[in-house]
Every structure is written in structure tokens, then in C-alpha cells.
């Protein structure tokens, strides 16, 4: 008789999830010499241990601590690029501007980027049928807790001037319910971070509005200022310039350092 299985509202675990995580880990440690010491089998075991046999609505940050420990990585704290609702462009930027880092340029972020996973209570099976949706089911699911944990740690590590890329084409340019707005903003350390500089990316070719005057940007400025961190906002009008550089990565002069 087939065992009854919980139906969640979100998509199930990404197919070939274990193989994907392991392959990504091997690839990352080959490309990044400072992470060559990492044992990818141990990383996978720690990742698996965070959610396998556990109720997928009852995951805690503590569950991920063994993985966090294995994935400990030092990135230059003054070269951090946060983003909200504009992931692809942020990644194109750091692909060219190699000395800046998004969370997904770190080992743990790279492992989990665009993947979904969850298990089931009291069974060692991975659920490939469905996983909890953050809104419809529960917020303490394996994916949400993972990103909350790594995002918090990433923000806590930042120093000096921290940049955040925001999507000027969205109705809420700054959304306090996003990972940036709910986690990263509140975990920047005022004793280490001097300034948060927001880059508001414009979509339209002829767009010449000053989106730094948007009410949601004023809200972000207020939150940041109350935390004793200076705030700066810049309108960025030609995102196609990132793509032109990505198409020619061999051009070493295609960086902001001149």
C-alpha cells in the first residue's frame, strides 16, 4: 500500500539534487584555490543532515550549523554586493567586476542557487513531489531557513561601503519583506559598515527619472540611518553595459577600475 505523503503548495526538490550539489561543490573548489581544502562529500552530508528526516515546516538555523561551519569562507568584507529582485544583473556585474562578491559567489550560495529541497519527517527520503511554499505553507522550510541563515552571515561579515543593487522597474524598489529588507539590512554591523550605497537600476532606454526619490528608497534610508549607517543612493541608467562586458570577458579593461 503506498504511504500517504504530505502535499505542499510549492514545487518539489530539484531533480538530481544530491548530484547537483556535489557537482557544484567540486566545481567551485576547483575554481577557487582558497576552498580546495573543502571535502565535498562532507559538505553534502552536512547539507543533507540539515533537512533529511525532519519535518519541512520545522527547520531551524541550528540545523544548518554543521554546513555553515564546513562552508566558512572569507570574502573581502569591503567588496560585498547585496541585491534584491535583480539577481541576474547582480551576477553579471560580479562576473565582470571580479573583486566584488554576491552571496551566490560564495561556496554556500553557489551550491544552493536556484535549487529547491525538502525531506519528510521520520523518513530518509527526499521529497521530489512538493515542498512547502513560504507564504501558503510555512516560513520555516528548508530553503527559506537556509537563505535566511547564509544571508544573515553574509551581511554580518560586510564592512566599509556595502553596495546593494535594486530593481528600479518594480513597484516596490525596496521591499522590506525581501531577504535584503528583512534579513540583510538588519544584520549589517554599524561598527563595521560605514555606508550602504544603493544602486537603483533603471530599465527603460529613455528613462531619466530620479528613482532615488522613490518613497521606498526613503524608507530604506530611514531604516539604515536609524542603525547609524550612512546611506547613499545612485541612479544607474545603462544596465546593457554590464552585458556588453559579459560578452567579452577576455577584455581585462572591462572593469570599473581604470
Amino acid at each position: 500500500v503506498p504511504r500517504w505523503r504530505q502535499q505542499w503548495s510549492g514545487p518539489g526538490t530539484t531533480k538530481r539534487f544530491p548530484e547537483t550539489v556535489l557537482a557544484r561543490c567540486v566545481k567551485y573548489t576547483e575554481i577557487h584555490p582558497e576552498m580546495r581544502h573543502v571535502d565535498c562529500q562532507s559538505v553534502w552530508d552536512a547539507f543533507k543532515g540539515a533537512f533529511i528526516s525532519k519535518h519541512p515546516c520545522n527547520i531551524t538555523e541550528e540545523d544548518y550549523q554543521p554546513l555553515m561551519k564546513l562552508g566558512t569562507q572569507t570574502v573581502p568584507c569591503n567588496k560585498i554586493l547585496l541585491w534584491s529582485r535583480i539577481k541576474d544583473l547582480a551576477h553579471q556585474f560580479t562576473q565582470v567586476q571580479r573583486d566584488m562578491f554576491t552571496l551566490e559567489d560564495t561556496l554556500l550560495g553557489y551550491l544552493a542557487d536556484d535549487l529547491t529541497w525538502c525531506g519528510e519527517f521520520n523518513t530518509s527520503k527526499i521529497n521530489y513531489q512538493s515542498c512547502p511554499d513560504w507564504r501558503k505553507d510555512c516560513s520555516n522550510n528548508p530553503v527559506s531557513v537556509f537563505w535566511k541563515t547564509v544571508s544573515r552571515r553574509f551581511a554580518e561579515a560586510a564592512c566599509d561601503v556595502v553596495h546593494v543593487m535594486l530593481n528600479g522597474s518594480r513597484s516596490k524598489i525596496f521591499d522590506k519583506n525581501s531577504t535584503f529588507g528583512s534579513v540583510e539590512v538588519h544584520n549589517l554591523q554599524p561598527e563595521k559598515v560605514q555606508t550602504l550605497e544603493a544602486w537603483v537600476i533603471h530599465g527603460g532606454r529613455e528613462d531619466s527619472r530620479d528613482l532615488c526619490q522613490d518613497p521606498t528608497i526613503k524608507e530604506l534610508e530611514s531604516i539604515i540611518s536609524k542603525r547609524n549607517i550612512q546611506f547613499s543612493c545612485k541612479n544607474i541608467y545603462r544596465p546593457d553595459k554590464f552585458l556588453q562586458c559579459v560578452k567579452n570577458p577576455e577584455d581585462s579593461s572591462c572593469t570599473s577600475e581604470i
Epitope: 547613499s232 556588453q244 579593461s253
Partner: antibody
Amino acid sequence: QVQLVESGGGLVQPGGSLRLSCAASGFTFSSYYMNWVRQAPGKGLEWVSGISGDPSNTYYADSVKGRFTISRDNSKNTLYLQMNSLRAEDTAVYYCARDLPLVYTGFAYWGQGTLVTVSS
Amino acid sequence: DIELTQPPSVSVAPGQTARISCSGDNLRHYYVYWYQQKPGQAPVLVIYGDSKRPSGIPERFSGSNSGNTATLTISGTQAEDEADYYCQTYTGGASLVFGGGTKVEIK
């Protein structure tokens, strides 16, 4: 090293046409926005026109819109400015300038300029 | 369109500090660039992105941008710094603007 060399300037009568060229070397030409900036004798700098690397996007100052056309040939590493219906106030040194990459929109490198004189 | 306003001239004694202002509405929301131009020569970028110095530009050149005003500061001015200086910004579309220029004279 980056080099920009303008050519095609000269004396032209009002209402006439001229085509300026800018030969680029020392960088991946197609990765960058390119621009024309001019400077009338004894005056300040005025941006004239810009073009994206691919080259789908073109931009013009109001003072030249409808009269000037910017274009580029990435296979020849060359930037062009076709100037029609020229007026006396178009008299200036015309500079070709390479844009900064990524989030910056300023001019990292300039050519030495070519003089355009519009006079009868 | 934003308009950038610069003083026509700034006079400074050798070794002293020259400050050139560039003002425009909400200028802090846009990156500002500074160019040096000597007679008969093409402009040279001395500051980009408000405060960054291109390689080869002496450390005595610095920039800042807050409120409605960007400032180019030349500390310990030298005779070779005598030139015209232009600020520039970009406010989207076809709105790429220069200030009117400031002549720096070393007394």
C-alpha cells in the same frame, strides 16, 4: 594602450554635410559605449551623441537631434558621426570619447579632436 | 534636465588647496566625473564615480558628492594643475551634461 584618432573635420558651408570617423585601438571596441563630445572655440564641453556597443541604442543632444547620426562598425573598430544641415553654431572641435564601463557613465579616454568649421 | 553650475574661476597660491564646486538638483543621486583640460589639449579624466581616481592621477586630486554639490579638491596645488576643470553627470536617456567649466589659476 587605448588610442582614439578622429578624422574627417574641415571647412563646410552652412547647410552642408560632413562625416567624422574615429579609429579605436587597444581595447575590445564592442564592449563599450562610444560618444562624441564637442567644444566650440573658447567655450565649454558639450556632449553630442552616444551609442551602445551592440549598437542598438543611440542617444542625441537636443541641439543635434534629427541632423546628426551616430553609428559604428565593430568589425573595423570605428565610430562615425554623420553631420547634415550644418549650422554656424556647430563649429567646434569634435572629440571621440570612450565611456567608462558598468555603473559609470563618464569618459575614460578621449581622442585629440578634429576641427569642424561651418562658415560661408 | 539637471543643470550643473561651476564657478568661472578659482585662484589659489602654490601649495594651497583649491576647491571647485559643481551644483545641481539632488546631485548626490548621480555619479559625478571631473575632467582637466589644458589649452590645446583633449580633456583628461581626473575623478570618476564621485571620488575614484584613475590610475596615473596624483593623490592630491580628490572628489566628494553630497546634497546638491559635488566638489573637486586639489591639495597642495602645483603649477602644472593650472587648467580648466569640468564636472559632468548623467541623468538618463539623452541627459548627459557638463558644467560650464572652472579656470584654476595658480597665483
